[in-house]
């Protein structure tokens, strides 16, 4: 008969730039040897070969050298595929094709996602505003996937649907920049909020602008930065937004722009003498030269590291000067937890077992929760440790000691408090005597 190949029913959701595991398993018969196994992963639609295992050997990746099997687990029936540095173009269906004597196949869907940045709000015109003036408020959010849903509302939470134009443009990586424009007639004052929703991650990014029509005070340069921290995934690029309002006749020769670390005052990047003075920060920073004349003093920080987390000050001097600090919050998603059981065979009700839940390379430190099959929290006899590697990313290991009942499911949930991302794993222990993993 046909070989039963099992894959998850739900799509695997993976963040751009992270690694994803496409799970696939089969039940090897007694006496099975890897020499009998023919394993092929391919794109479901085009049938393009992705990775294969044949004649007892891993035949390697046919997919930009970004795939890998789990060779130590193949003999136990684990034919899962690791896809590294996920890109938008990877989204779609992958077929796992297993042949021993019989053969079988199953397809697993990969859903790619990328969180949208906190929206930046711009106002046009942005000075000398009076009640009754018509203003254009632009809400921009960057580098997300898939396409966003955008909602506008006023200070009372009432949706604003008229006179809204939203455009979404994909860059070379397939990530979307969304720009939504609201045209509104000013009242005495008003708050306008823009919410950008990622439909896959169910992640909402929002910003608001409060407009009090009056003449802005003269004197110091008003430097504007986002109030909330900028959240950036490790390895991605982040934009630290900073803007000022240039006066009529302003020229870049007058501008002295300095970015520096708020605490240590270490120089990061500067613009003086009408030219970009370059990066003083490991050559990973850049300005937006074409936008400086319009008052956009934002800084692009490339290949974000954990060590970049903290406050950056944007210092603008024209005739007067002003400064403002923006916080960078670094984050990295935790991997799907792996579960191990000790002892893992000949288990009987009443035995005490140790279940270890391990999740890797996340930031910041995780929150770990255990629960049973009924969703009841398990808090007793839990020990959780978190260790940072050289890059500052945390590996979390949580150990639950429990006395077995007739059967039971034990779930571990690893939560990233910044990304509000939950990764969970569970183990079900049934029958007696029992073995883990369950044998065919």
């Amino acid at each position: 008969g046909a070989l039963e190949v099992q894959v998850p029913e739900d799509p695997v959701v993976a963040l751009v730039g992270t690694d994803a595991t496409l799970c696939c398993s089969f039940s090897p018969e007694p006496g099975f040897s890897l020499a009998q196994l023919n394993l092929i992963w391919q794109l479901t639609d085009t049938k393009q070969l992705v990775h294969s295992f044949a004649e007892g050997q891993d035949q390697g990746s046919a997919y930009a050298n970004r795939t890998a099997l789990f060779p130590d687990l193949l003999a136990q029936g684990n034919a899962s595929l690791r896809l590294q540095r996920v890109r938008v173009a990877d989204e779609g269906s992958f077929t796992c094709f297993v042949s021993i004597r019989d053969f079988g196949s199953a397809a697993v869907s990969l859903q790619v996602a990328a969180p949208y940045s906190k929206p930046s709000m711009t106002l046009e015109p942005n000075k000398d505003l009076r009640p009754g003036d018509t203003v254009t408020i632009t809400c921009s959010s960057y580098q997300g996937y898939p396409e966003a849903e955008v909602f506008w509302q006023d200070g009372q939470g009432v949706p604003l649907t008229g006179n809204v134009t939203t455009s979404q443009m994909a860059n070379e990586q397939g990530l979307f920049d969304v720009h939504s424009i609201l045209r509104v007639v000013l009242g005495a004052n008003g708050t306008y909020s823009c919410l950008v929703r990622n439909p896959v991650l169910q992640q909402d990014a929002h910003s608001s602008v409060t407009i009090t029509p009056q003449r802005s005070p003269t004197g110091a340069v008003e430097v504007q930065v986002p109030e909330d921290p900028v959240v950036a995934l490790v390895g991605t690029d982040a934009t630290l937004r900073c803007s000022f309002s240039p006066e009529p006749g302003f020229s870049l020769a007058q501008l002295n722009l300095i970015w520096q670390l708020t605490d240590t005052k270490q120089l990061v990047h500067s613009f003086t003498e009408g030219r970009d003075q370059g990066s003083a920060y490991a050559n990973r920073t850049a300005l937006f030269p074409d936008l400086l004349a319009q008052g956009n003093a934002s800084l692009r920080l490339q290949r974000v590291r954990v060590a970049d987390e903290g406050s950056f000050t944007c210092f603008v001097s024209i005739r007067d000067f002003g400064s403002a600090a923006v916080s960078l919050q670094v984050a990295a998603p935790y991997s799907k937890p792996s579960m191990t059981l000790e002892p893992n065979k000949d288990l009987r009700p009443g035995d005490t077992v140790t279940i270890t839940c391990s999740s890797y390379r996340g930031y910041p430190e995780a929150e770990v929760f255990w629960q049973d099959g009924q969703g009841v929290p398990l808090t007793g006899n839990v020990t959780t440790s978190q260790m940072a590697n050289e890059q500052g990313l945390f590996d979390v290991h949580s150990v639950l000691r429990v006395v077995l009942g007739a059967n039971g499911t034990y779930s571990c949930l690893v939560r990233n408090p910044v990304l509000q991302q939950d990764a969970h794993g569970s183990v079900t222990i049934t029958g007696q005597p029992m073995t883990f993993p369950p044998e065919a």
């Epitope: 520096q260 005052k265 120089l267 003086t272 370059g278 050559n283 210092f315």
Partner: antibody, heavy 120, light 110 residues
């Protein structure tokens, strides 16, 4: 005319800290970078770091990271260099020098130098 | 941030020419046209003689000239005079807002 006036000689014990000041006059203080350069007895010049007086932003030579701190007081047009955890090899004349308005500019004006002696 | 290499000493008779070399890497001398040269008499602060490889500040005699080829910069003093006897240091921008000096060369007028 442009002048950089440095504080007087200092004698410190190993492990202590020293602060050297450099008062600028004759130009717009906040418009030009100030660099610190040191010279051990009978040795060559060694770049220590720089500060932008406008914002207080700093860059230090890797060798001095964690031990040197440069600050400025715009009200008195003075720059300060503090070097901590002193060792005997920090004995040197410390010069402040005015750079340009841009980075990568030469040092046209120099202070007279401050001799720091580290001795137990 | 390693130092730039200069010859320990050079000498010449009055009226002759001497050239001092300054060798770095593509990260400093070779990477930027920001090499400067300083003259230092004993017990005095350094004095700027050449900047941006070959430019002379006002007040510096035209006997002093600078050039650069690849990772090596050079200072030439033509028509050597007694007051030119001093230590000479090259300095180069090294990226990321840092500077690096040369080891120094003692010029002796015979």
């Amino acid at each position: 005319q442009v002048q950089l006036q440095q504080s007087g000689a200092e004698v410190e014990k190993p492990g202590a800290s020293v602060e050297v000041s450099c008062r600028a006059s004759g130009y717009t203080f906040t418009s030009y970078y100030i660099h610190w350069v040191r010279q051990a007895p009978g040795q060559g010049l060694e770049w220590v770091g720089m500060i932008t007086p406008l914002s207080g932003g700093t860059t230090y030579a890797q060798k001095f990271q964690g031990r040197v701190t440069m600050t400025r007081d715009t009200s008195t047009s003075t720059v300060y260099m503090n070097l901590s955890s002193l060792r005997s090899e920090d004995t040197a004349v410390y010069f402040c020098a005015r750079g340009g308005r841009a980075v990568a500019s030469s040092f046209e004006f120099w202070g007279q130098g401050t001799l720091v002696t580290v001795s137990s | 941030q390693s130092v730039l290499t200069q010859p320990r000493s050079v000498s010449g008779s009055p009226g002759q020419s001497v050239t001092i070399s300054c060798t770095g890497t593509s990260s400093d001398v070779g990477g930027y046209n920001y090499v400067s040269w300083y003259q230092q008499h004993p017990g005095k602060a350094p004095k700027l003689m050449i900047y941006d490889v070959s430019k002379r500040p006002s007040g510096v005699p035209d006997r002093f000239s600078g050039s650069k080829s690849g990772n090596t910069a050079s200072l030439t003093i033509s028509g050597l005079q007694a007051e030119d006897e001093a230590d000479y240091y090259c300095c180069s921008y090294a990226g990321s807002y840092t500077e690096v000096f040369g080891t120094g060369t003692k010029v002796t007028v015979l």
